[in-house]
């Protein structure tokens, strides 16, 4: 099985124990590590941060002691914006220039492939996204002709039904991608006005349309029905939780909220907590399991957080094995307890290790 793990370059800027550099990563933990994100400027792939090249080097030296490890560079992301991707993909010359710039950049900096993180193609971009993938793959095949190992091509796709329908021609893009990471998280957010888990495995008992689509099981099944081969589908598992501020004394699933949860000490983003911050939060909190959805949530005071723990990730891995998927994807290594100092287990990357162990279990 593949264990595809994302590392985010901005994690270096978190304070104190939250600061994560690629040399803190475990070289034997994941089969693939994806560096997020690269930029595109002047229609060429480019660094996002000035120090990216240093971090590329730190990441890719992990392969010195584990030659089986593959590293990919993810291009795009939320801050890049869909419009900029759209302009490049829809213009033949811009697309060509971008595609041509990718192999030398990846080779120079020691990457084994490219991950496309166009979040998200619009309805009018659907065909252009397919063309971009098809032409990128053709370029990778051509570039590898002189006996080089062919560069890998992957894409991170939304798990939301509406986005899947409008953005992707699943059957066509699947032909050209080496694997597809389906982002089976962020199904529920503060915009809903109520508490809810952002990455449930199954549909909740109370879920009515459109909530019946907002779970991992539906998204995976839908992708498979649309023509994604199970052998290329990698299922996303988050090492972060989504938090809410409760608006009343109600604390269960579906309780009213006044907004996102308070920012974490290190991640400093309202409504999001890294797993290592959740471990802190759990001291003195009340933990519940949403039985049908097979995921936990915790409450403390007026704060509510839905997250994944070692038990829920094992359930998810068993599910993806039952579905004969290619493996699991983790967003993100730097949100797991990468130091092993927060979650009281004396184990670095406890969630990712639990996923790895479950994948290896017979």
């Amino acid at each position: 099985y593949k264990l595809v793990c994302y590392y985010t370059s901005w994690s270096q800027y978190r304070e104190g124990d939250g600061s994560c550099f690629p040399d803190a990563l475990d070289r034997f933990l994941c089969t693939h590590i994806i560096y997020s994100f690269a930029n595109i400027s002047n229609d060429h792939i480019d660094t996002w941060e000035w120090n990216d090249v240093t971090l590329y080097g730190m990441l890719n030296t992990l392969k010195n002691r584990n030659p089986n490890l593959k590293t990919l560079l993810s291009v795009g992301g939320w801050n890049f914006g869909s419009q900029r991707f759209s302009k490049i993909a829809s213009n033949t010359q811009s697309r060509r220039t971008f595609i041509k710039s990718v192999p030398p950049f990846l080779r120079t900096h020691g990457f084994d492939g490219l991950d496309l993180a166009w979040l998200y193609p619009g309805r009018r971009d659907k065909q252009h996204f397919t063309t971009l993938i098809k032409e990128m793959k053709a370029e990778f095949i051509k570039e590898a002709q002189p006996g080089k190992k062919q560069l890998l091509l992957s894409a991170a796709l939304s798990a939301g039904k509406v986005t899947i329908d409008s953005s992707y021609d699943i059957a066509k893009i699947s032909q050209h991608l080496d694997f597809i990471s389906i982002m089976t998280y962020d199904f529920h957010g503060a915009w809903r006005g109520t508490t809810g888990h952002h990455s449930p495995l199954f549909r909740g008992q109370e879920d009515a349309s459109p909530d019946r689509f907002s779970n991992t099981d539906y998204a995976v099944g839908y992708m498979l029905r649309l023509g994604a081969p199970a052998s290329k589908l990698v299922m996303g598992i988050p090492t972060f939780g989504r938090s809410f501020t409760l608006a009343s004394s109600e604390t269960g699933v579906g309780a009213p909220i006044s907004g996102p949860g308070i920012p974490g000490r290190f991640t400093k983003e309202a409504g999001t907590l890294a797993y290592y911050e959740i471990c802190d939060f759990l001291r003195g909190a009340t933990v519940h399991r949403i039985l049908g959805q097979q995921v936990p949530y915790a409450t403390k005071g007026n704060q509510w957080v839905g997250y994944d723990d070692q038990e829920s990730v094992k359930s998810k891995v068993q599910y993806l094995k039952d579905r004969q998927l290619a493996g699991a994807m983790v967003w993100a290594l730097d949100l797991d307890d990468f130091q092993g100092s927060f979650c009281g287990q004396d184990l670095r990357f406890p969630l990712t290790n639990a996923i790895k162990d479950a994948l290896a279990a017979t």
Epitope: S41, W50, N51, P104, R107
Partner: antibody, heavy 117, light 107 residues
Framework: EVQLVESGGGLVQPGGSLRLSCAAS????????MSWVRQAPGKGLEWVSA????????YYADSVKGRFTISRDNSKNTLYLQMNSLRAEDTAVYYC??????????WGQGTLVTVSS | DIQMTQSPSSLSASVGDRVTITCRAS??????LNWYQQKPGKAPKLLIY???RLQSGVPSRFSGSGSGTDFTLTISSLQPEDFATYYC?????????FGQGTKVEIK
């Protein structure tokens, strides 16, 4: 083997202009950011400017902003520094450097710029 | 701008000595500190990047440590070719700034 060769330095009057060039070889030029760093006679190092591999991002020290322009021609593997409205305090050896991220892992031999009347 | 302060500004040492140079940033720069060596009439040479990572080809007697605001360059056993001026540089945010330099002279 990485090589960086600067040229274009010389004597120029205050208010004048000069264009420095840096010819690069031995690495995939377009995949790396590049920098200019200067050193006034007997003084320490001062970072001047930097440009990303695709030319999409440029940065300048406050002391040269609005007067100096960094650029590159990836088809010629060449980095440039256009220096206008030169002042006496711009007198220095100008080094072109390949950026390994934000450190400069290879440097040219430098070219001397003297601003004097 | 982030100010970088090196100390001492100069030092005298003998071959075989352990030499330590410190660099302090005016604000936290995480691990984004580089160390360079410069000999008279020559271009600077990168020794250490990202506070503690040894640049390829640099002898292992050079080491760097620190994070946040306080950093150290250590030469474990000074060799004749190490007599030079050493500069620290922060690369956390532009403008990237250098320390004023530390000249290591023969005692």
């Amino acid at each position: 083997e990485v090589q960086l060769v600067e040229s274009g330095g010389g004597l120029v009057q205050p208010g004048g202009s000069l264009r420095l060039s840096c010819a690069a070889s031995g690495f995939t030029f377009s995949s790396y950011a590049m920098s200019w760093v200067r050193q006034a006679p007997g003084k320490g190092l001062e970072w001047v400017s930097a440009i990303s591999g695709s030319s999409g991002s440029t940065y300048y020290a406050d002391s040269v902003k609005g007067r100096f322009t960094i650029s590159r021609d990836n088809s010629k593997n060449t980095l440039y520094l256009q220096m206008n409205s030169l002042r006496a305090e711009d007198t220095a050896v100008y080094y072109c450097a390949k950026a390994q991220g934000t450190s400069a892992d290879f440097w040219g031999q430098g070219t001397l710029v003297t601003v004097s009347s | 701008d982030i100010q970088m302060t090196q100390s001492p500004s100069s030092l005298s040492a003998s071959v075989g000595d352990r030499v330590t140079i410190t660099c302090r940033a005016s604000q936290s720069i995480s691990r984004w500190l580089n160390w360079y060596q410069q000999k008279p009439g020559k271009a600077p040479k990168l020794l250490i990047y990202a506070a503690s990572r040894l640049q390829s080809g640099v002898p292992s007697r050079f080491s760097g440590s620190g994070s946040g605001t306080d950093f150290t360059l250590t030469i474990s056993s000074l060799q004749p070719e190490d007599f030079a001026t050493y500069y620290c540089q922060q690369s956390y945010s532009t403008p990237w700034t250098f320390g004023q330099g530390t000249k290591v002279e023969i005692k």
